[in-house]
């Protein structure tokens, strides 16, 4: 039951985590105007990974596609890809997870196969998240660069009189989103992975006893002891009938529509 | 179409107050702030101060914060104006605007002629 | 505050001629987001407010005719007019709409010689 929950939290954890890491890659305000000691602006600056946008205090807004590969920082194009493959890689996460939801039974999946099916989720749920945080953290690294070096000339005087505000940019509603979707993504590979354990099969040792009865021979076959590791055959407690093999988990798993529930 | 009615013209005393009014018609009356303008006679235009009608919040110029209160009754779609403790210097014609793209007044009222005198 | 200085003061003209009025910011009204000038030109005929002419220091309102020109970047700007009719005898003002508080210069009247 209990690795039944920390599967299940995991898996919506880590289905709210990417969510969030997509919401934070397509959002405009990873980096929105420093508003604070400059000069008054009747127009607010913002960018994001893909375009950047001017809001006037008219209530327009206009926003501008960057139209470029060649021309963008190459630290840009670092964040768009760590991004992406951390999308990517959680999708592929999820699709494996809702397969290796103990909650849902598909054909005869045996536990084996689930456990390593959540591991591998899982495995991909925390590459995901960090994928997601590296992305954001260069990008806040980036801005922390830039902003410093801006308020080093944040006011170029020209023959004196004219003076220019340069534009300083600090963390936008992205950055936030991003770090707190990256690290719930990999708390929800942390806990597939846990839940992992205890999917796996452990084989135990049993004496063999042969129960000889009138019509059908029953034997319970000993297992060599091994560590659970996730991996390897699953021998937990068979039952091998002339009928087949069955898990206890298997015994009430009958084609129906509630089987995912 | 976009209209911004004002009324005529206020003869005032020294020292009281006004309340001027501009009411908002063919438009989202919440959508856009509204802004003031004071042009005293044959002299150039200075920009008091805006309103946000959704939330009520305001943002002046220095020169007007004791001069000048904004308000708005969205009920109404009407802005409000309150220009205290008069003086000769606060005779002109006051507008009320609405921004347009690049922060432009592209729509006006036609103005409320204040008069302060004895 | 940032200070727009007009020049001249008053231009005299005849109808027909090419005309030419300056504009000068204290500060770049330059924004760097969209690489936009926050300079705005309206004319005044007396008794009227103001009218819209130009934004984004070149961008013509919608029905103003297309012998007002808008040019400049940063602090220099100018509105020039290529033919001058008789209904363009007015006040034209030009306006900082990048900065609080928005300001406005004195304005330069074009009436006839």
């Known amino acids: 039951m209990a690795v039944t929950a920390c599967q299940g939290l995991g898996f919506v954890v880590s289905l709210i985590g990417i969510a969030g890491i997509i919401a934070a890659t397509c959002m405009d305000q990873w980096s929105t105007q420093d508003l604070y000691n400059n000069p008054v602006t009747a127009v607010f600056n913002y960018q994001g990974l893909w375009r950047s946008c001017v809001r006037e205090s008219s209530g327009f807004t206009e926003c501008r596609g960057y139209f470029t590969l060649l021309g963008l920082p190459a630290m840009l194009q670092a964040v768009r890809a760590l991004m992406i493959v951390g999308i990517v890689l959680g999708a592929i996460g999820l699709l494996v997870s809702i397969f290796a939801l103990k909650c849902i039974r598909i054909g005869s999946m045996e536990d084996s196969a689930k456990a390593n099916m959540t591991l591998t989720s899982g495995i991909m749920f925390i590459v995901s998240g960090l994928c997601a945080i590296a992305g954001v953290s260069v990008f806040a690294n980036m801005l922390v660069t830039n902003f410093w070096m801006s308020t080093a000339n944040m006011y170029t005087g020209m023959g004196g009189m004219v003076q220019t505000v340069q534009t300083r940019y600090t963390f936008g509603a992205a950055l936030f989103v991003g770090w707190v979707a990256g690290g719930l993504t990999l708390i929800g590979g942390v806990m597939m992975c846990i839940a992992c354990r205890g999917l796996a099969p452990e084989e135990t040792n049993y004496k063999a006893v042969s129960y000889h009865a009138s019509g059908h021979s029953v034997a319970y076959k000993p297992g060599g002891f091994k560590a659970s590791t996730g991996f390897g055959s699953n021998t937990k407690n068979k039952k091998i009938y002339d009928g087949g093999a069955r898990t206890e988990d298997e015994v009430q798993s009958y084609p129906s529509k509630h089987d995912y529930v | 179409e976009v209209q911004l009615q004002q009324f005529g013209a206020e003869l005032v005393k020294p020292g009281t107050s006004v309340k001027i009014s501009c009411k908002a018609s063919g438009y989202t009356f919440t959508d856009y702030n509204m802004d003031w303008v004071k042009q005293s006679h044959g002299k150039s235009l200075e920009w008091i101060g805006d309103?946000?009608?959704?939330?009520?919040?305001?943002r002046y110029n220095q020169k007007f914060k004791d001069k000048a209160t904004l308000t708005v009754d969205k009920s109404s779609s009407t802005a409000y104006m309150e220009l205290r403790s008069l003086t000769s210097e606060d005779t002109a014609v006051y507008y009320c605007a609405r921004l347009y793209y690049g922060n432009s007044f592209a729509y006006w009222g036609q103005g409320t002629l204040v008069t302060v005198s004895a | 505050d940032i200070v727009m200085t007009q020049s001249p003061s008053s231009l005299p003209v005849t109808t027909g001629e090419r005309v030419t009025m300056s504009c000068r910011s204290s500060q770049i009204l330059l924004n760097s987001g969209n690489q936009k000038n926050y300079l705005t030109w309206y004319q005044q005929k007396p008794g009227q407010p103001p009218k819209l002419l130009i934004y984004?220091?070149?961008t013509r309102d919608y029905g103003v005719p297309d012998r007002f020109t808008g040019s400049g970047s940063g602090t220099d700007f100018t509105l020039t007019i290529s033919s001058v009719q008789a209904e363009d005898l007015a006040v034209y003002y030009c306006?900082?709409?990048?900065?609080?508080?928005?300001?406005f210069g004195a304005g330069t009247k074009l009436e006839l010689k």
């Open positions: 984004w220091a070149s």
């Open positions: 306006q900082n709409a990048y900065f609080y508080p928005f300001t």
């Open positions: 309103v946000n009608p959704n939330y009520s919040t305001t």
